[in-house]
């Protein structure tokens, strides 16, 4: 019994003066609380509490359920206790079959004994199954058996409290352990699409998937920089124990331009938080933006190939595409494909393959594309570079020598005189007249240049060379002169 120094209030005394008492079932329990300032007796077992204001607690016919802790309290709040076991061969355990444990924490299997003198007080698996190898427990006859550091793997474990009574193993009612998981990671969140592009009035719907070990995970859709509560719908599934999935679907039935922005799906548990965002862009009407992948002015050499390539953004998706040249539509030689297979792709590529281009095939090539809202086009000006071709080279009646050449870019014509029979004509002759003949004609195709020199300047036999050249190449024509007396005679020109 407790003792304290004189002058200080002391705890009550209990008779019988023992910490534990064993009573046979059917016998009387008689407990006396000795204290001038007696207040009450309390009885506790398995979360059940009873009170008695008499200083003597009497139970005439004790039952197993009278097993428990009897506490006497005085007016100073000081108390003393005695634990009474009511031995009942037919009821060795008092049980509260609720059994919940938090992962990594201890939990109590509440099966206190009614007889402290039994042996082998322990846990057993149901139907003779062994307990998990790593399951550790600590028995306490007055409280039950504590399972140490509960594991997730113990969820729905069926077990009994067990004890040996007079050489026989006795089992309690069964317990089913329910384990509440510890959150050991942030929720896993994902979104159905990272971005959405819509026209005004269309429905916006986006789904966030949240995965965690328990349904006790918080999730919400938030509009960035806004406190407005968004309307969302949930679906959830348990794919197994500790494998929970929630789908939170956010819907705006008729999107407006000012609904554009970033939407965040946020989830958190006791470990931490995670989020994922999706971007909504609402446009008042569809659009097409075309981006040439090469310069829209194209120079290509005669006989070579060129690819005219455009990328374009189209929303809604493109319905008609075509390439046109000189009012003629190409039926082949071109391809059109999405830039990516992503379902939110709005970028496309179109390629026109021009092969072995002739000088006559320069001109404007136009790409046209349309969707349900708009049309758009882009033009490429294709110039075919051709080596000069000398169209005519003549001696005119007025004594002029004239050379006419065509090519692209515009040819330059130079004149040279070779005295005698020399083949190398180095002495240049200045032309009297140079004209570009078709400068005001069609913008594409070959340019024609005419150049003339005065042949009267030549006093000796020899050859005159007309050389037409541009970036692509050069071509020459020759005039041969022979003097007979004072007469100058032109021999037929040759190239």
């Amino acid at each position: 019994q407790p003792s304290v120094s004189p002058g200080e209030p002391s705890p009550p005394s209990i008779h019988p003066a023992k910490s534990e008492l064993i009573v046979r079932v059917g016998n009387e329990i008689r407990l006396l609380c000795i204290d001038p300032g007696f207040v009450k007796w309390t009885f506790e077992i398995l979360d059940e509490t009873n009170e008695n204001k008499q200083n003597e607690w009497i139970t005439e016919k004790a039952e197993a359920t009278n097993t428990g802790k009897y506490t006497c309290t005085n007016k100073h709040g000081l108390s003393s206790s005695i634990y009474v076991f009511v031995r009942d061969p037919a009821k060795l355990f008092l049980v509260d079959r609720s059994l919940y444990g938090k992962e990594d924490n201890d939990t109590l299997v509440r099966c206190p004994l009614t007889d402290p003198e039994v042996t082998s007080y322990s846990l057993k698996g149901c139907q003779g199954k062994p307990l998990p190898k790593d399951l550790r427990f600590v028995p306490d006859p007055k409280a039950g058996i504590t399972i140490k550091s509960v594991k997730r793997a113990y969820h729905r474990l069926c077990l009994h409290c067990s004890a040996d009574q007079e050489g026989k193993s006795v089992l309690s009612d069964k317990f089913i352990l329910k384990v509440r998981p510890a959150f050991k990671a942030v929720p896993v969140v994902s979104v159905s699409k990272a971005s959405y592009l819509l026209r005004e009035g269309e429905e916006f719907t986006v789904t966030c998937t949240i995965k965690d070990v328990s349904s006790s995970v918080y999730s919400t859709w938030k509009r960035e920089n806004s406190q407005t509560k968004l309307q969302e719908k949930y679906n959830s599934w348990h794919h197994g124990d500790f494998n929970y999935e929630r789908q939170a679907t956010l819907t705006i039935s008729s999107a407006r331009v000012n609904d554009s922005g970033v939407f965040m799906c946020y989830a958190n548990n006791t470990f931490g938080s995670a989020n994922v965002t999706t971007t909504l862009e609402v446009v008042d009407k569809g659009f097409i933006n075309i981006f040439p992948m090469i310069n829209t002015t194209v120079f290509v050499n005669d006989g070579e190939n060129v690819d005219l390539i455009v990328e374009y953004e189209a929303f809604p998706k493109p319905e008609h595409q075509q390439w046109i040249y000189m009012n003629r539509t190409f039926t082949d030689k071109w391809e059109d494909y999405p830039k990516s297979e992503n379902e939110s792709n709005i970028r496309y590529v179109s390629e026109l393959h021009l092969t072995r281009l002739k000088g006559t095939e320069g001109g404007t090539y136009t790409f046209l594309v349309s969707n349900s809202d708009v049309n758009a086009s882009i033009a490429f000006n294709v110039y075919v570079n051709t080596k000069p071709e000398i169209l005519t080279y003549d001696r005119l009646v007025n004594g002029m020598l004239q050379c006419v050449a065509a090519g692209f870019p515009e040819p330059t014509i130079d004149w040279y005189f070779c005295p005698g029979t020399e083949q190398r004509c180095s002495a240049s002759v200045l032309p009297v007249d140079v004209q570009t003949l078709n400068a005001s004609g069609p913008p594409f195709g070959k340019l024609v240049v005419q150049s003339s020199i005065d042949s009267s300047a030549f006093k000796h036999n020899g050859t005159v060379e007309c050389k037409a050249y541009n970036d692509v190449g050069k071509t020459s024509a020759y005039f041969n002169f022979a003097f007979k007396g004072n007469n100058k005679e032109q021999i037929h020109p040759h190239t």
């Epitope: 328990s214 349904s215 006790s216 679906n235 929970y244």
Partner: antibody, heavy 119, light 106 residues
Framework: QVQLVQSGAEVKKPGSSVKVSCKAS????????ISWVRQAPGQGLEWMGG????????NYAQKFQGRVTITADESTSTAYMELSSLRSEDTAVYYC????????????WGRGTLVTVSS | DIQMTQSPSSLSASVGDRVTITCRAS??????LNWYQQKPGKAPKLLIY???SLQSGVPSRFSGSGSGTDFTLTISSLQPEDFATYYC????????FGGGTKVEIK
């Protein structure tokens, strides 16, 4: 043994709210799942939502989302269900039950609270 | 939501009869299926959890079977106290109950 003790019957006007309590006597209340299930006269059972007090977060059936609020007070081992914007079709017996979240079965039920909605 | 369809909705039987009630889920619910008994004016009582596990204190004449979408509750020999309404309930998605099967005295 653990019991779930519910508050008494209520008569409410349409448009008003009702708050029903459910006190658990004993056990590891904080780790229980406490759900609310209702039963209209002569009808079947309908889960409204539930909470695990330790985690503090309620889950609700889609039908009741935004109209029901389930809370729990660990210090008093009491769960609450508040239903707002009441209409006549909300007249039912409202049961609290242990279980209903994270695949828990309903292994313990309260006696039920009759809520009558009438003008 | 997962729909739970119970059949029959009612049946008449005599004491000692073997009674079978079926419950079909609109999609797979693995073994997350529970059976309850309810008597008039009383709260439901758990009979079977996880499709086939007998709840403590429930007589062994009650048994459950099935997995995936099809489940059965069997009462091997009907007793007078078994006349009641029986409900199945799934726990995979938002909880839903079957419509109930009323077992009446023939």
């Amino acid at each position: 043994q653990v019991q779930l003790v519910q508050s008494g019957a209520e008569v409410k006007k349409p448009g008003s709210s009702v708050k029903v309590s459910c006190k658990a006597s004993g056990g590891t209340f904080s780790l229980y799942a406490i759900s609310w299930v209702r039963q209209a006269p002569g009808q079947g059972l309908e889960w409204m939502g539930g909470i695990i007090p330790h985690f503090g977060l309620a889950n609700y059936a889609q039908k009741f989302q935004g109209r029901v609020t389930i809370t729990a007070d660990e210090s008093t081992s009491t769960a609450y269900m508040e239903l707002s914007s009441l209409r006549s079709e909300d007249t039912a017996v409202y049961y609290c039950a242990r279980g209903g979240l994270d695949t828990d079965e309903f292994d313990l039920w309260g006696r039920g609270t009759l809520v009558t909605v009438s003008s | 939501d997962i729909q739970m369809t119970q059949s029959p909705s009612s049946l008449s039987a005599s004491v000692g009869d073997r009674v079978t009630i079926t419950c079909r889920a609109s999609q797979s619910i693995n073994s997350y299926l529970n059976w309850y008994q309810q008597k008039p004016g009383k709260a439901p009582k758990l009979l079977i959890y996880a499709a086939s596990s007998l709840q403590s204190g429930v007589p062994s004449r009650f048994s459950g079977s099935g997995s995936g979408t099809d489940f059965t509750l069997t009462i091997s020999s009907l007793q007078p106290e078994d006349f009641a309404t029986y409900y199945c309930q799934q726990g995979v998605s938002d909880i839903t109950f079957g419509g109930g099967t009323k077992v009446e005295i023939k």
